[in-house]
């Protein structure tokens, strides 16, 4: 048993059929010695008397808010949550496996630049009785500070019969060094509590591996005289790290016809302009990637040829 | 060339070669099914590689103030990786394919280190750890880890030279 926060405790339960459970001793936080009784949740059934209460935690029915009283007055509370191991594996029931980039990916994180700021998000089908708390650090043995905000509901989607809820959190490394080569990964830890179930999820990454620039901005076309060619120009996104002579991007320019089946013409360039042939009803799209490290491409920025 | 006394390197040549190094490092080890090498344990194997750290002066301001600290650090790293790529980790079993970019990568690391330091001038180099994995599968894993680490190192080096070529070239 360990303390999650004041008066909230997590019992680690290795469950299997006929498992004996965990013996837990609760102590009433009071100087009083006599006349103390214990109840669970809203029930008035007295579970025991005395300053301490010993319980055998075998299942969720044994978890909840234990209260000690004296003469009708509440003395203290202890909320017991269960962290369950089933078949030797800690439960991961609260969050949905996003399966990208690999199985058992519950948390996904992205950074728009090298400033040490990043966003993580996760999915659940649970709509009520749900709380999250997020902690992060650079490295684990001698951790350096990363400050995370509160997790917030950022999107709701309908998936078949189910509603899916997306939560996200923003974190910022306290002493970020954008130009350095990372040697210790960022660790992100999410505590999730649904009803009386506690679960924790972790992700470990280098900022360089989660970089995804915003799309190029100010995408413009300039027709070239007496030609079907156009000069496409764009700018670095505002959110990208500066100076651009140091934090450089590379770009992919694509000409795509109306039909998805039509052949796509692609040009790769380090410049912020390119000359392409504009076909009727086609569109021109540009996306960006770190020039020197193959992290994710940005989403496309697009303009119609006409 | 970074000649004794701290004159400037051939920024543009260094830029071109470092960008080529980035391309080669990624073609030598693309993201194989997002294999997370940090989950594979034995951290000590790649913990000893020289990293370009915050105080090494490789940021734009540090380069403007005195690029020599940073160039020395990059040189150290290039020599370190050049030795690793020439060691039995890469020469032993399982043999690399004849068209593997590792050979080109090895030559380019040497080329860039020579651009930074001419014969007769010696910056101190970091001791290469004695990593001699016995099993071919351990060797393979170590190759992946070294190449992943090299990708991060050459990315920073390439940024340094690109910025130097754009802002510090005479």
């Amino acid at each position: 048993i360990w303390e999650l926060k004041k008066d909230v405790y997590v019992v680690e339960l290795d469950w299997y059929p006929d498992a004996p459970g965990e013996m837990v001793v609760l102590t009433c936080d009071t100087p009083e010695e006599d006349g103390i009784t214990w109840t669970l949740d809203q029930s008035s059934e007295v579970l025991g008397s005395g300053k301490t209460l010993t319980i055998q935690v075998k299942e969720f029915g044994d978890a909840g808010q234990y209260t000690c009283h004296k003469g009708g007055e509440v003395l203290s509370h202890s909320l017991l949550l269960l962290h369950k191991k089933e078949d030797g594996i800690w439960s991961t029931d609260i969050l949905k496996d996003q399966k990208e980039p690999k199985n058992k990916t519950f948390l996904r994180c992205e950074a728009k630049n090298y400033s040490g700021r990043f966003t993580c998000w996760w999915l659940t089908t649970i709509s009520t009785d749900l709380t999250f708390s997020v902690k992060s650090s650079r490295g684990s043995s001698d951790p350096q500070g990363v400050t995370c905000g509160a997790a917030t509901l950022s999107a709701e989607r309908v998936r078949g019969d189910n509603k899916e809820y997306e939560y996200s959190v923003e974190c910022q490394e306290d002493s970020a060094c954008p130009a350095a080569e990372e040697s210790l990964p960022i660790e992100v830890m999410v505590d999730a509590v649904h009803k009386l179930k506690y679960e924790n999820y972790t992700s470990s990454f280098f900022i360089r591996d989660i970089i995804k620039p915003d799309p190029p901005k100010n995408l413009q076309l300039k027709p070239l005289k007496n030609s079907r060619q156009v000069e496409v120009s764009w700018e670095y996104p505002d959110t990208w790290s500066t100076p651009h002579s140091y934090f450089s991007l590379t770009f992919c320019v694509q000409v795509q016809g109306k039909s998805k089946r039509e052949k796509k013409d692609r040009v790769f360039t380090d410049k912020t302009s390119a000359t392409v042939i504009c076909r009727k009803n086609a569109s021109i799209s540009v996306r960006a990637q770190d020039r020197y490290y193959s992290s994710s491409w940005s989403e496309w920025a697009s303009v119609p040829c006409s | 060339r970074a000649v004794p006394g701290g004159s400037s390197p051939a920024w543009t040549q260094c830029q071109q070669l470092s960008q080529k190094l980035c391309t080669l490092a990624w073609s030598a080890h693309p993201l194989v099914g997002h294999m997370d090498l940090r989950e594979e344990g034995d951290e000590e194997t790649t913990n000893d590689v020289p990293h370009i750290q915050c105080g090494d002066g490789c940021d734009p301001q540090g380069l403007r103030d005195n690029s020599q600290f940073c160039l020395q650090r990059i040189h150290q790293g290039l020599i370190f990786y050049e030795k690793l790529l020439g060691s039995d980790i890469f020469t032993g079993e399982p043999s690399l394919l004849p068209d593997s970019p590792v050979g080109q990568l090895h030559a380019s690391l040497l080329g860039l280190s020579q651009l930074l330091q001419p014969e007769g001038h010696h910056w101190e180099t970091q001791q290469i750890p004695s990593l001699s994995p016995s099993q071919p599968w351990q060797r393979l894993l170590l190759r992946f880890k070294i190449l992943r680490s090299l990708q991060a190192f050459v990315a920073v080096a390439a940024r340094v030279f690109a910025h130097g070529a754009a802002t510090l070239s005479p």
Partner: nanobody
């Protein structure tokens, strides 16, 4: 919204068998733990059995252990309770319930309930 419909109840002699079924609709059934409860006349509703969402681990009340078997078919969105060696004290209305806490014998840990099916065991 989730709907649960029980079937398979009836009158049976002591020592006999019955198989109860519960069909779920309205949400992805595989994401829930499933349970059966029962309520005998004049008594409180009590836990019978539960099956987990993932690996079909099972949890039983002591009174039915060895006689009842709970199973589920995620493809068909059903959960079944095979009741053997029935006793007169097994007479009750049997309710199917789903929740998200396994193992739990506590009523309030279940989110959705069926209307119930009557099982009568005569001596």
């Amino acid at each position: 919204e989730v709907q649960l419909v029980e079937s398979g109840g009836g009158l049976v002699q002591a020592g006999g068998s019955l198989r109860l079924s519960c069909a779920a609709s309205g949400r992805t059934f595989s994401g829930y733990d499933m349970g059966w409860f029962r309520q005998a006349p004049g008594k409180e509703r009590e836990f019978v059995a539960q099956i987990s969402r993932h690996n079909s681990n099972t949890y039983y009340a002591d009174a039915v252990k060895g006689r009842f078997t709970i199973s589920r078919d995620n493809a068909k969105n059903t959960v079944s309770l095979q009741m053997n060696s029935l006793k007169p004290e097994d007479t009750a209305v049997y309710y199917c319930a789903i929740g998200s806490l396994f193992p739990s014998s506590r009523e309030r840990d279940y989110d959705y309930w069926g209307q119930g099916t009557q099982v009568t065991v005569s001596s």
